[in-house]
């Protein structure tokens, strides 16, 4: 039977030019983590295995930063960024778990914030 | 079975700067993070930053922003640190260390860094 | 930054004995937590990731729980080669920060 739980962060927002972390946790559940898949609708972000490490996936690769732990830092980002974000975790004996993030991108206001964003 | 060979030892005047080599082997270097921890006995340890080979992202603590450079070659699964301005206060074991799964899973001999003035 | 906190500096015990070294974040760190050994003149070695999962070869009387703030890590049956420093590191946040350290003594 699956036990866990996954939290996120839920519904998100960013501005435009600037960076966000996507997280997600899993919890309840003693089950063996051994990947999690970042999924953007139906397109692959990347992926953290635990043998294998980080793959970024081309299309992603100038504007994704592993971590903090299994989540992703998206940078860069553009109003076309609007939208759901999956984290998949394989575990096992249980088998996957899904969490969902609804990112927001807004357009920056000049007059309010000059600087660029910093990775959190 | 990863492993991460260390630069040796390094005296320094203060004032001038230091370029660390972490050389590591048994893994595909570009899908790992690259981790730097500096050890004080007075600080414990602190961790500088990260550098991944797959894409060349880095992240710094603010702390060692300007002051800490990391960067790596590919080609020879060689991640570097350069510390530049240096002072007493960098005075201090400097370890790379690769991170695993949820921790950081392999770490070097460590580098001790001795500023003289 | 998160602030990750290990109130005892030193601890004392005896071979055979049951000690637990505590962790205290500053804020929610899930279990984003792992535990290092430090023995004199080497490096760091993983000891749990995740809060309670054992790193590979690490003996069984070696455990860690907690989430949230609170961690803990558990040797039982200590051991003399148990004498070392013992960290814990937060992996939820950048900065990544670690404890202060706590010295395992023995008697």
């Known amino acids: 039977m699956m036990t866990g739980t996954i939290e996120t962060t839920g519904n998100i927002s960013a501005e435009k030019g600037g960076s966000i972390i996507l997280q997600c946790h899993l919890s309840s559940t003693t089950a063996q983590v051994t990947q999690v898949n970042w999924e953007q609708q139906d397109q692959l972000l990347a992926i953290c295995n635990a043998d294998l490490g980080w793959h970024i996936s081309p299309s992603f690769k100038d504007r994704v930063a592993p971590g903090p732990g299994l989540g992703l830092t998206l940078q860069s980002l553009t109003v076309n960024d609007t939208g759901e974000y999956f984290c998949i975790y394989h575990t096992y004996p249980d088998g996957t778990y899904t969490g969902r993030i609804f990112l927001e991108v807004l357009e920056s206001s000049v007059a309010e914030h000059g600087a660029r964003f910093q990775i959190p | 079975q990863a492993y991460l060979q260390q630069s040796g030892a390094e005296l320094v005047r203060s004032g001038a700067s230091v370029k660390v080599s972490c050389k590591a082997s048994g893994y595909t270097f570009t899908s790992f993070n690259m981790h730097w921890v500096k050890q004080t006995p007075g600080q414990g340890l602190e961790w500088i930053g990260y550098?991944?080979?797959?894409?060349?992202?880095?992240n710094y603590n603010q702390k060692f922003k300007g002051k800490a450079t990391l960067t790596a070659d590919t080609s020879s699964s060689t991640a570097y640190m350069q510390i530049s301005s240096l002072t007493s206060e960098d005075s201090a074991v400097y370890f790379c260390?690769?991170?695993?799964?949820?921790?950081?899973?392999?770490w070097g001999q460590g580098t001790t860094l001795t500023v003289s003035s | 930054d998160i602030v990750m906190t290990q109130s005892q500096k030193f601890m004392s015990t005896s071979v055979g004995d049951r000690v637990s070294v505590t962790c205290k974040a500053s804020q929610n760190v899930y279990t984003n937590v792992a535990w290092y050994q430090q023995k004199p003149g080497q490096s760091p070695k993983v000891l749990i990731y995740?809060?309670?999962h054992r790193y590979s070869g690490v003996p069984d009387r070696i455990t860690g729980s907690g989430s949230g703030t609170d961690f803990t890590l558990t040797i039982s049956n200590v051991q003399s080669e148990d004498l070392a420093d013992y960290f814990c590191?937060?992996?939820?946040?950048?900065?990544?920060?670690f404890g202060g350290g706590t010295k395992l003594e023995i008697k």
């Open positions: 590191q937060q992996h939820n946040r950048y900065p990544y920060t």
């Open positions: 550098f991944f080979p797959g894409n060349g992202a880095t």
């Open positions: 995740s809060a309670s």
């Open positions: 260390a690769r991170e695993g799964w949820l921790s950081l899973g392999y």
